[in-house]
Amino acid sequence: YNNFRKSMDSIGKKQYQVQHGSCSYTFLLPEMDNCRSSSSPYVSNAVQRDAPLEYDDSVQRLQVLENIMENNTQWLMKLENYIQDNMKKEMVEIQQNAVQNQTAVMIEIGTNLLNQTAEQTRKLTDVEAQVLNQTTRLELQLLEHSLSTNKLEKQILDQTSEINKLQDKNSFLEKKVLAMEDKHIIQLQSIKEEKDQLQVLVSKQNSIIEELEKKIVTATVNNSVLQKQQHDLMETVNNLLTMMSTSNSAKDPTVAKGEQISFRDCAEVFKSGHTTNGVYTLTLPNSTEEVKAYCDMEAGGGGWTIIQRREDGSVDFQRTWKEYKVGFGNPSGEYWLGNEFVSQLTNQQRYVLKIHLKDWEGNEAYSLYEHFYLSSEELNYRIHLKGLTGTAGKISSISQPGNDFSTKDADNDKCICKCSQMLTGGWWFDACGPSNLNGMYYPQRQNTNKFNGIKWYYWKGSGYSLKGTTMMIRPAGF
């Protein structure tokens, strides 16, 4: 027994001593060097930390725990052997001594030993559970890492595939761009060639235009000569008429001997006895300025002063403010009498305005306004109309109330555009309005869907360009 105690001491383990009577029992149990120190007591049901230890540390710790378990197992076996041996000896001693009390001591010692063993077993179970828990945790971590790695590998593969696709697309687009560039260069060359051709054409046209302008100048000069001749002829005719009137003064007392003949309008010409259609010289009272006007002495009782006529497109009506003011064209053909003369005339007494229209299908219509006058130039020759009757529409195609007169160089309309430039010709444009009798002249079969034709909406509708128009005035009381 002493021998055993000595060998146990030499190992240097913790001693458990029980003193009973003359006998003293000493048990040596192994110390777990690698277990927790007393400063941080072990709690079997402690919550594990969230972040697991690094993989290598965990492996090392597992190995240490395995070693400890192995040691503990060996110690337990030794302890069992020792207890068995010791019990045999004790039983012999008990039997020899036959001391009843010693039995109780032995039971107590046994109980203590069993308790110690149970405690050790519990601790071992806890350690085992901990090891198992840690192992499971590590396995899970490894699995997660494995899955994550797989996922990353898949993503890398997908990205690589995507990059390849993009590279293919990029190269395709590069080819396309190059092809387009080539095409563009060819087109540019083609455009340049066309431009050069057009420039040649423009040069040719310019020279033709110059020729035409020269011809126009010549024609204008000839026209002026003809007009002068006509004027002279008219004067001669008037002189002859005067002479005839003078010789027949007894028969016609209306013209006294030596009286100067001048007519303000065709109504006066008609009343003086000139009842044939034709061009007459008109002069405003208290004025020396003369104008040539065509007089219609047949329609509706005669005495009509023609202030506008369109019939064949021979005269350009896209004229300046000044030209529309003084008048232009040929009184026996297409012409505009002149805004200034008409303004002065219609402000001296009340006049009616009749607009006679012809379409390309052989139809005729008219609009009659019972009161018409133009404002002065300061008020842009604004048109004033009242009392519409006639067959060319129940609604006035000249916008009401009247608008200012506009020409290509005088924009007095109510449009954000310039109506005179857009529709051509001078007119009392609104924005731009239902009429324009000074628009472009279009021949038959080319006269529909026109944006700038000779228009009278409330008779022929939009886009219909008329064949002929006549605007005529006469005193209201004629």
Epitope: C415, P434, F451, Y458
Partner: nanobody, 129 residues
């Protein structure tokens, strides 16, 4: 020469749909406004919808708002009128017409009927069960 040709008319049941086309030639849509008009027997011609390409604005008559949609395709020089939820009172001859976009009175957005100078021949739309 300026020309407008309508197509797409026909017989359709109430609640049905039709798409009218107006093909323009002789001018480009950029500088013009295109209007759709209709005329029922014995009635006045009335404006249905208009589109102005230079600023993208559109106009609809109260009677067709929410049912009709006007659009244009400049590459085809064509204007369309998509007509949904058709009613018997939509029965009429439908015309498209053109007006220079700038022909606008100061302060106004759309054009009187008489400003539309170019017209198509029309296409008949009949809504009946």
């Amino acid at each position: 020469d300026v020309q407008l040709v309508e197509s797409g008319g026909g017989l359709v049941q109430p609640g049905g749909s039709l798409r009218l086309s107006c093909a323009a030639s002789g001018f480009t849509l950029d500088d013009y406004a295109i209007g759709w008009f209709r005329q029922a027997p014995g009635k006045e011609r009335e404006g249905v919808s208009s589109i102005r390409d230079n600023d993208g604005s559109t106009y609809y008559a109260d009677s067709v708002k929410g049912r009709f949609t006007i659009s244009s395709d400049n590459s085809k020089n064509t204007v369309y009128l998509q007509m949904n939820s058709l009613r018997p009172e939509d029965t009429a001859v439908y015309y498209c017409a053109a007006v220079p976009a700038g022909r606008l009175r100061f302060g106004e957005q759309w054009y009187p009927l008489y400003e539309y100078d170019a017209w198509g021949q029309g296409t008949l739309v009949t809504v009946s069960s």
